[in-house]
């Protein structure tokens, strides 16, 4: 007897982090024997959507013409072949930005920092939030994800970096969010350029550098030294 059908692959184009109002296409790729594709959303009672396969039948397209809060969440897809339903795909987390007003990102004492010294990136929101994310351009994952203890709401989060090295140089943005849905983020802050001096190396990654699948320095959390930030937020590394 044949084993279970292989699980399909699920992905989003242009990506899984989408600004409010923008379009996104979710793709589910199975096998050439697929008869039907089904997309399930976590906590949605009925199959979220179902589509015929596109020729040559090994994938299906699920279109979202305009991103809203309702579409943010965790998805899985399946396909049906003549012998039955496949295993579920790995989950796709569709995140919407633009749910809240943008926070402000600043560097203390300054965005110009000498190698070996300390700098703290400060993300401040106008209204109290309980989750803050710091993103570095061209990094594969959020560098730091700070969540408040016991749902306490904060206006800011501090991201200390010490000692600073050339790899810390680059462009940063931050987002804020409410804990009830980590799929809904604020508008991004304006970019902050952190410039590290006192090193012969170019502090900024080359624009042609591709993100390696193995985690390099840019993919690692920025390990702060000293105490947990004064904001009362608990630190989580993604």
């Amino acid at each position: 007897q044949a084993g279970p059908l292989p699980k399909p692959t699920l992905w989003a184009e242009p990506g899984s982090v989408i600004s409010w109002g923008n379009s996104v296409t979710i793709w589910c790729q199975g096998t050439l024997e697929a008869r039907e594709y089904r997309l399930d959303k976590e906590e949605s009672p009925a199959p979220w959507d179902r589509q015929n396969p596109l020729e040559p039948k090994n994938k299906a397209r699920f279109s979202i013409p305009s991103m809203t809060e309702d579409y943010a969440g965790r998805y899985r897809c399946y396909y049906r072949s003549p012998v039955g339903w496949s295993q579920p795909s790995d989950p796709l987390e569709l995140v919407m930005t633009g749910a809240y007003s943008k926070p402000t990102l600043s560097a203390l004492p300054s965005p110009l920092v000498t190698s070996g010294k300390s700098v703290t990136l400060l993300c401040q929101s106008r209204s109290p939030m309980d989750t803050f994310l710091l993103i570095k351009e061209r990094a594969a994952h959020p560098l730091l994800h700070l969540r408040s203890e016991h749902g306490a709401q904060q206006h800011q989060a501090e991201f200390p970096m010490s000692p600073v090295t050339s790899v810390h140089g680059g462009t940063y943005r931050c987002f804020s969010s409410h804990g009830f849905s980590h799929y809904l983020l604020s508008h991004p802050s304006d970019p902050l350029e952190l410039i590290v001096s006192g090193s012969l190396e170019d502090p900024r990654p080359s624009p042609t550098r591709s993100v390696s699948t193995a985690a390099g320095p840019e993919d690692q959390p920025l390990m702060p030294t000293g105490s947990v930030p004064h904001s009362g937020l608990r630190r989580h590394w993604e």
């Epitope: 959303k41 949605s44 009672p45 009925a46 199959p47 979220w48 959507d49 179902r50």
Partner: antibody
Amino acid sequence: QVQLVQSGAEVKKPGASVKVSCKASGYTFTSYWMHWVRQAPGQGLEWMGEINPSNGRTNYNEKFKSRVTMTRDTSTSTVYMELSSLRSEDTAVYYCARDRYDEGNAMDYWGQGTTVTVSS
Amino acid sequence: DIQMTQSPSSLSASVGDRVTITCRASQDITNYLNWYQQKPGKAPKLLIYYTSRLHSGVPSRFSGSGSGTEYTLTISSLQPDDFATYYCQQGDTLPRTFGQGTRLEIK
């Protein structure tokens, strides 16, 4: 028990639009897709499309795509089917039917039907 | 779209007869075949889904079989209540499509 109750008969002029409702009870409304199927006098059954009451996602028969709109109101457990630019060939009984969504993709419970007459 | 063809279009039979209605699909529909009964002026009722599974409340004299493109509905012993029109429907792909119907009349 599962019940689908549809709105009353309609008489429309060519070029007009009609909106038929289907109120569901006896089950969790958002857990099952709903189909619309029509039947012209003395003819067979024709599938028009389906809607997911949970999120409003729709799949339409290409034949009706430019003229049909299916919507839902979760607060009243009601789905709607609106057909525009009516012509005499649209004279038919319109049915809503609940989707089983398991093996077969069958329609397990049907509304009583709504007669739509298109006449000048 | 998948075309569904029923045969015969109509048939006359007597109470107690065994009756078979055939439904042919224009391509393999992987057992996603359903049967409905409709009486004049009434909505269709689901009888059998997924080729051979009886919907709740449907008498056991109704049965279904088939695979690939050929499917049959059998009524083992006709009862007076069974005279109606029967439709097959494929649920394999969108759009869903129905056969043209088979009218079962009293001989």
